[in-house]
Interface confidence: low
């Protein structure tokens, strides 16, 4: 299953499959997730080690048992790959690292006014993988405001150095934010020239393209089909690059197929997994396990559940079957691709779905009325769980926010439905940033069921929580995916990085905003909050947030939206925007429904008809 916990001051011993430099543990974990053999990782922050060569070291590890012995190492951070973690699987990494220079091949230098602009340039350059920016206070005047675009053979820095007044980060192409655009066409009987960066075996050009998309240096590819004239080159997928970023030439060639990486696609990237099953095909590789199962789909499920399994072959040979079950060969290789592909067999083959982000785990698991005042514009994909609840009567307007917590579930405030409990007047927009982008053609979700907390009363502020079941499940993308729920009764975690988002008013007597706003707000103790609201009862099922001096808050139109906090690299839904005295007033914090206190209710209501929970929360 999916394991998300991090181990502080711990280092996994042995099992190394790769090492690299990464700026933090989260990026190291992402590299582990996308590495075909990595199950565990250990990261050494600069503060944890004196050996300059090992600072920022990210060590990717494999283990036959799925675990390795942990040794104590002050400052080290270890954890698990996020394979099998559904919507948490993403190659997108937005963080900017201050005081850090990520080294690589500097291929472009320009003067820019901010680190954000530098990151945008990197994202809009086909070859840029990461960047460094020298701020206006950099010690050498001639380098100030320099934006260095970089790449490296492995897509990660060749070294990372602590350096004052330098800021570094990664391209946001994996966040589907590139302005370059992509070419989705597949070119039959056409071979591209230029430099081969890798060679793998794939059953078709589409798997080849997905591998190219997630390979750090692949910009385009050529695939040789299974009827290619040279037998040893059949099913070869050549991952390619060039100085210019595009093929310098193409040659008409029977039984070849070429195309481009889809990493520069805007707003949508292919999933990093291959779900198709190939009948009459055998995939060769190292044997992991052999099991008898009923049907090729069960074989694929078995492979997906066994975390080390990369691909499988389901044999229909009479000697491999007994009764209704046949042998399911679970296999793996060094690069995650078959070492041999044979056609015309009595088998069916396919890949593990461990990297698909539409897995069953609708919400992450761990084992062990009111708009933003004083906020700033959000960017695409920054808050992918945020939804807009709109009402269509004669005209259509935004009324409330909400949070996507599963394929078919949205969590919001009960008071959003005061006077409007009709399912069919509501339209739920997900994966949007600008309300003005909504047209009559913009897809929206309709409500199947509104579940208002049984103890909620319009006249009181208590139990201000409601669940919406959507008529149809939503697919997850970089711009539309759920937020993790907290643990039941989560009281021990100290959240220091909390944000409220919404399209609500920017001042008490304002109007709905076009661009989704965000504001960083500190949590306030319930005792402190009660002092500020002596006419109301602040219960343990509420959480408060705000600045003593005011100026930043949620406001009308933000109701039902999320209060999220980042802890150990993971965002959690801590509160639901509920009420407050005015907006952003001095010593009048915003009051939010405390989600952790309602975990039993949420899990009970989201149980499917067969009794299986639609979502799980950290236990």
């Amino acid at each position: 299953g999916c394991l998300t916990q991090l181990y502080e001051n711990a280092f996994f011993r042995g099992g190394d499959v790769a090492s690299m430099y990464t700026p933090n543990a989260q990026y190291c974990q992402m590299r582990c997730t996308f590495h075909p053999r990595c199950l565990l990782f250990s990261f050494l922050p600069a503060s944890s080690i004196n050996d300059m060569e090992k600072r920022f070291g990210c060590f990717l590890k494999d283990s036959v048992t799925g675990t390795l012995p942990k040794v104590h190492r002050t400052g080290a951070v270890s954890g698990h790959s996020l394979k099998q973690c559904g919507h948490q699987i993403s190659a997108c990494h937005r963080d900017i690292y201050k005081g850090v220079d990520m080294r690589g091949v500097n291929f472009n230098v320009s003067k820019v006014s901010s680190v954000e602009e530098c990151q945008k340039r990197c994202t809009s350059n086909i070859r840029c993988q990461f960047f460094s920016y020298a701020t206006q206070t950099f010690h050498k005047a001639e380098y100030r405001n320099n934006c260095l675009l970089k790449y490296s053979p492995g897509g990660t820095p060749t070294a990372i150095k602590v350096l004052s007044n330098v800021e570094s980060g990664f391209s946001l192409k994996p966040c589907a934010l590139s302005e370059i655009g992509c070419h989705m066409n597949i070119f039959q009987h056409l071979a591209f020239s230029d430099v081969d960066v890798a060679r793998v075996l794939t059953p078709d050009a589409f798997v080849c393209r997905t591998i190219c998309t997630y390979h750090p240096n692949c910009l385009f590819f050529t695939f040789y089909t299974n009827v290619w004239k040279i037998e040893s080159q059949r099913n070869v997928c050549l991952l390619k690059t060039s100085e210019s970023g595009t093929p310098s030439s193409s040659t008409p060639q029977e039984n070849t197929i070429s195309g481009y990486s889809l990493l520069t696609c805007k707003r949508t990237l292919p999933e990093p997994c291959h779900s198709k099953i190939y009948p009459g095909v055998d995939f060769g590789g190292e044997e992991l396990n052999v099991t008898f199962v009923k049907g090729v789909n069960v074989c694929q499920e078995t492979c997906t559940k066994m975390i080390r399994c990369q691909f499988f072959t389901y044999s229909l040979l009479p000697e491999d079957c007994k009764e209704e079950k046949c042998k399911c060969f679970l296999r793996l290789s060094m690069d995650g691709s078959p070492t041999r592909i044979a056609y015309g067999t009595q088998g069916s083959s396919g890949y593990s779905l461990r990297l698909c982000n539409t897995g069953d785990n609708s919400v992450c698991t761990t084992k062990t009325s009111t708009r933003i005042v004083g906020g700033t514009n959000s960017s695409w994909g920054e808050w992918p769980w945020q939804v807009s609840l709109q009402v269509k009567l004669t005209a259509q307007r935004h009324l409330c926010g909400g949070s996507l917590i599963g394929h078919q579930w949205v969590l919001t405030a009960a008071h959003c439905f005061d006077g409007l409990p009709l399912q069919d007047v509501w339209r739920i927009y997900s994966g949007i940033l600008n309300l003005s982008d909504i047209t009559k053609d913009t897809p929206f979700s309709q409500i199947k069921e509104i579940i208002i907390h049984q103890n909620y009363k319009v006249s009181e502020g208590n139990h201000d929580i409601a669940l919406i079941k959507l008529q149809a499940p939503l697919n997850y993308t970089e711009f539309q995916k759920p937020i993790c729920l907290p643990s039941k009764g989560d009281t021990s975690t100290i959240y220091t990085n909390c944000w409220v988002t919404g399209w609500g008013f920017s001042k008490e007597k304002g109007e709905i905003q076009n661009i989704l706003q965000k504001v960083n707000i500190p949590l306030v103790t319930n005792e402190e909050c009660q002092k500020r609201y002596q006419d109301y009862k602040i219960t343990q099922r509420m959480v408060c947030a705000g600045y003593k001096e005011g100026g930043k808050d949620a406001c009308k139109g933000d109701s039902g939206g999320p209060l999220v906090c980042k802890h150990n690299g993971m965002w959690r839904l801590v509160g639901i925007t509920s009420w407050g005295e005015g907006c952003a007033r001095r010593e009048q914090p915003g009051v939010y429904t405390k989600v952790a206190e309602y975990m039993d209710w949420i899990l009970e209501k989201t149980q499917s008809s067969d009794g299986k929970a639609q979502m799980q929360s950290p236990a």
Partner: antibody
Framework: EVQLLESGGGLVQPGGSLRLSCAAS????????MGWVRQAPGKGLEWVSW???????TYADSVKGRFTISRDNSKNTLYLQMNSLRAEDTAVYYC????????????WGQGTMVTVSS | DIQMTQSPSSLSASVGDTVTITCRTS??????LNWYQQRPGEAPKVLIY???TLESGVPSRFSGSGSGTDFTLTIGSLQPEDFATYYC?????????FGQGTKVEIT
Amino acid sequence: EVQLLESGGGLVQPGGSLRLSCAASGFTFSWYTMGWVRQAPGKGLEWVSWIYFGGLTTYADSVKGRFTISRDNSKNTLYLQMNSLRAEDTAVYYCARLGGPLDAFDIWGQGTMVTVSS
Amino acid sequence: DIQMTQSPSSLSASVGDTVTITCRTSQTINNYLNWYQQRPGEAPKVLIYATHTLESGVPSRFSGSGSGTDFTLTIGSLQPEDFATYYCQQSFAFPYTFGQGTKVEIT
């Protein structure tokens, strides 16, 4: 306003040459695949050539080796150099942008007439 | 190359009629099919892309359907400005190809 404006058409003798230009405005030209589509008098549309945002070019078999497509992103201009012209190249030549999802020609110029005749 | 066959090549209809134009491809193209309208003396304009998605500003009387190899453009309640030639185009495989066109004339 998004716009494409062709120029350079005219009357030319068989075997002669012409260079068509297409000036783009209202969008970030360098991001888009651009192409030429032609229409012979009273006939349907025929794709001629296009150039991807990265510079890779492709041509219809009927013009391969005779026509060259190019672009100057700094000038927001697309070109079609037509050599060894034949009578069957007589047509209205449209400049078009490949922009919609799944590669529709979403923006078209008004067209420029090329007549090849002795 | 993928061959595109449009039918009929021309048709006569009256204002208010519903008109259906079909486009058949020589191999499966999933939903990579676009429809264009060309009025006399004008450049073509895209009506529908990806089989059934209406280009913004195109009236809702135009609709597209189909998948694989058989596709349809339907014009419900024909208006005077709809008398034009309609082309289908595939963008599934290089080279992209157009149908030969269907001319919709006034009865």
